[in-house]
């Protein structure tokens, strides 16, 4: 399938001009290669009319140009002084020959319709309203006023000043006069449909002295806006329907032959195909709203329409906006697993891609919630503290320049199952959706910490050990201290020479962490984990409480937190990478609504880095060792 995209059908009238935009994939080669516009002949040959190399055919001389916009990955063909001879099939494309990558465009140029000389033309979009102005002479002021629509032989009444209204216009036609002007009456017709298009006659008075005026009403379907998006990226449909529908329910639907199937509306309807990857956000009181879809698939390509109606469904005669979405399969967004599986008590490491050109952008992880219009509250971010209910079990590891950041969630419960989004305050296309599935654990965890009831005594030495199976022997083991700014890896050293994995003793594989001497600041969550290079694997968590040497001193003993840490882990390693660079912290930015909100998070960011030292001062040593 060609990755070039443009308008399928373009229509205009004689003497007018057209502007045709064609899209191409974002690559250096594409930006610099030849762009062309050619006309298809009966033989299948496509004759070049204009190209970016400077070629211009005789029939386009002085009336056409082709402009490349490499920053937008588009090129535009402008053609003026159209004639009916320009009607035909064309291609816009890329390549040294006209057999390169291309998109078919049909151009239709119609004759200017012949209308009576005094005809006033009104051009309106479907669903909008029109106010027709009907002037008359003063002597016809007391007389009946009317508007009729011309049919083949007669003129069918629409409305008159005696409250007579054609049934098909009841509730949407009004006749009125304004101010003190006794020489004009007006007819307003709302909720326009294609059927309303045609010739009308305004009349004041009867017989030969009547005042008449011809009116031509053109009702147009809105021109679809073209959207060119990469596979796995995201798209935002910005819908602005006007104040008159501000209080109506809003919807987005996708054209399917004759019908338009609702994907989402503000009344709570949502197509299951878009579960976990769609949000509808009312913008203001003027009827503006947006729909965001992430994780674009091939089958998402098509014709979309937004609208407003109390039913939340498409309704004839109500305003609409349309788009043609093209999903480019030559995507720059890497193909990652969209489903990650974990088990209760276990952990998952999720790799989130971002635009490598924007390594300094702020990274976030949010949980998609489908209630209402759908929303995605941020759970953690490079400058957003971890949400309280995720204390001790969620961290984001940034890997600047690598194009991936990692989110680790441990102590999993079945309630963690659901959809999560990776997003940044930079390139909004790089939003990805992950579905997390959590099954009940059926075996012992891969990582186990002893002692399980971890209470350290102030000033003494305290050691905890993390047992791991032989399959993790060759992987790097680490301990880190969790804070709501991240999990800071503690310095480690190997205990004893490494044995070959063949003689791996299942019972003696452990990595220990020693606190010496224990201080009050040591209280908190610690993680034991494994990683291979920059790819994070499993983790387990333990809460270490610190108490005074004297017995009977009270401390909170988070038994269920520790109990949770020892439930089974499933061997589910998701490709990911990590940085030991500390995370920055600002107050949580709150629920994620749209790009602007995330952008604001970045704008507010304070450069107050957490301390970069993993070891601590005052002669205390914090270390982890592996056997």
């Amino acid at each position: 399938k060609s990755p070039i995209f443009g308008p399928q059908e373009v229509s205009s009238i004689e003497g007018d001009s057209v502007s045709i935009t064609c899209y191409y994939p974002d690559t250096s080669v594409n930006r610099h290669t030849r762009k062309y516009w050619c006309r298809q002949g009966a033989s299948g040959m496509c004759t070049t009319l204009i190209s970016s190399n400077g070629y211009l055919s005789k029939e386009y001389s002085g009336r056409a140009n082709l402009i490349n916009f490499p920053e937008n990955n588009t090129f535009v063909i402008n053609i003026e002084q159209l004639t009916q001879d320009d009607t035909g099939s064309y291609k816009c494309g890329l390549g040294t020959s006209n057999r390169g990558l291309s998109f078919d465009v049909s151009l239709e140029v119609s004759q200017v319709p012949e209308l009576p000389s005094d005809t006033h033309v009104y051009t309106k979009d479907i669903g909008r309203n029109v106010t027709i102005e009907c002037p008359f002479k003063r002597e016809n002021a007391p007389s009946k006023k009317s508007l009729c629509k011309k049919t083949n032989q007669s003129c069918e009444l629409v409305i008159d000043s005696t409250e007579k209204v054609n049934p098909s216009y009841i509730g949407r036609a009004k006749l009125f006069m304004k101010g003190t002007d006794l020489t004009v009456f007006y007819v307003n017709i709302s909720h326009l449909t294609h059927n309303d298009a045609g010739l009308y006659i305004c009349q004041a008075g009867e017989g030969p002295s009547a005042d008449k005026k011809n009116v031509d009403l053109q009702v147009l379907a809105p021109e679809p806006e073209l959207l060119y998006k990469d596979l796995r990226s995201s798209v935002t449909f910005e819908c602005d329907l006007g104040r008159e529908v501000a209080n109506e329910a809003k919807y987005l639907c996708r054209m399917n032959k004759e019908t338009c199937d609702v994907i989402i509306n503000t009344l709570g309807k949502r197509d299951p195909d878009f579960e976990g990857r769609i949000l509808i956000t009312p913008k203001d009181d003027n009827g503006r709203f947006s729909v965001l879809i992430t994780g674009l698939r091939k089958e998402d390509a098509g014709h979309y329409q937004c609208g407003a109606h109390s039913s939340g469904l498409p309704q004839e005669g109500w305003p609409i906006q349309t788009w043609q979405l093209f999903v480019n399969e030559e995507s720059t967004i890497p193909n990652r697993r969209s489903v990650v599986k974990g088990v209760t008590g276990g952990s998952v490491a999720i790799a989130c891609p971002y635009n490598p050109k924007e390594s300094s952008s702020l990274k976030y992880w949010c949980r998609w919630e489908g209630d209402g219009n759908g929303h995605c509250p941020v759970l953690v971010g490079t400058q957003a503290q971890v949400q309280e209910e995720y204390e001790g079990r969620l961290a984001l590891f940034d890997q600047p320049g690598n194009g991936t950041y990692t989110v680790i969630l441990n102590q999993l419960t079945t309630e963690d199952a659901g959809f999560y989004w990776c997003l940044t305050n930079g390139d909004s296309r790089w939003r990805t959706t992950i579905e997390l599935q959590v099954a009940e654990a059926t075996r012992e965890p891969n990582l186990e910490v002893t002692p399980q009831n971890a209470t350290a005594v102030l000033g003494e030495t305290f050691t905890v050990s993390c047992h791991y199976p032989c399959k993790f022997y060759s992987q790097e083991k680490y301990w880190c201290k969790w804070s709501n700014k991240g999990c800071h890896i503690l310095p480690s050293h190997d205990e004893g020479a490494r044995q070959s994995s063949v003689s791996c003793d299942q019972s003696s594989q452990l990595v220990s962490m020693t606190l010496n001497p224990v201080s009050k600041e040591d209280e908190g969550w610690y993680w034991c984990g494994v990683k291979q290079g920059q790819t994070y694997g499993e983790t387990t968590a333990i809460y270490i409480a610190v108490e005074e040497r004297t017995r009977g001193s009270s401390h909170v003993n988070p038994t269920d937190a520790n109990a949770r840490a020892k439930v089974a882990l499933e061997e589910e390693v998701v490709d990911s990478s990590i940085s030991e660079k500390e995370n920055k912290a600002i107050p949580n930015p709150g629920p994620f609504a749209n790009e602007r909100e995330i952008q604001n998070v970045g704008d507010q960011a304070q450069e107050n880095r957490a301390s970069g030292d993993a070891g601590s001062a005052d002669g205390q040593s914090r270390s982890s060792s592996s056997k």
Epitope: I159, T162, V165, L175, F176, T180
Partner: nanobody, 125 residues
Amino acid sequence: QVQLVESGGGLQQAGGSLRLSCAASGRTVTVMTVGWFRQAPGKEREFVAAITMYGERTYYADSVKGRFTISRDNAKNTVDLQMNSLKPEDAAVYYCAARTYVSGIYDRFDDYNYWGQGTQVTVSS
């Protein structure tokens, strides 16, 4: 703006007659239709009759057809409601209403944008 003032209400015996009058002032050229509505205690406001200003046409509620007549006097800017064969159920406060557009729906009170203060009609049996 359009101002409306009703007059002619009062007490009348069943079978008798009354003539209500509605005087319009202000920007009366914009008035397209004038209607009479009534409201009895504890009941909804209901349509009685209407007349169009540009091209005379009259409309009546079924309950008053043949007994009430609506008419206008353009020179005086008045609209009258002649009520004959009055019945006890005709007793109510009668309101004159005007609207500055036509839409084919003349019998809904919320489609009228100007209202008078009302005049009381009492019918004794």
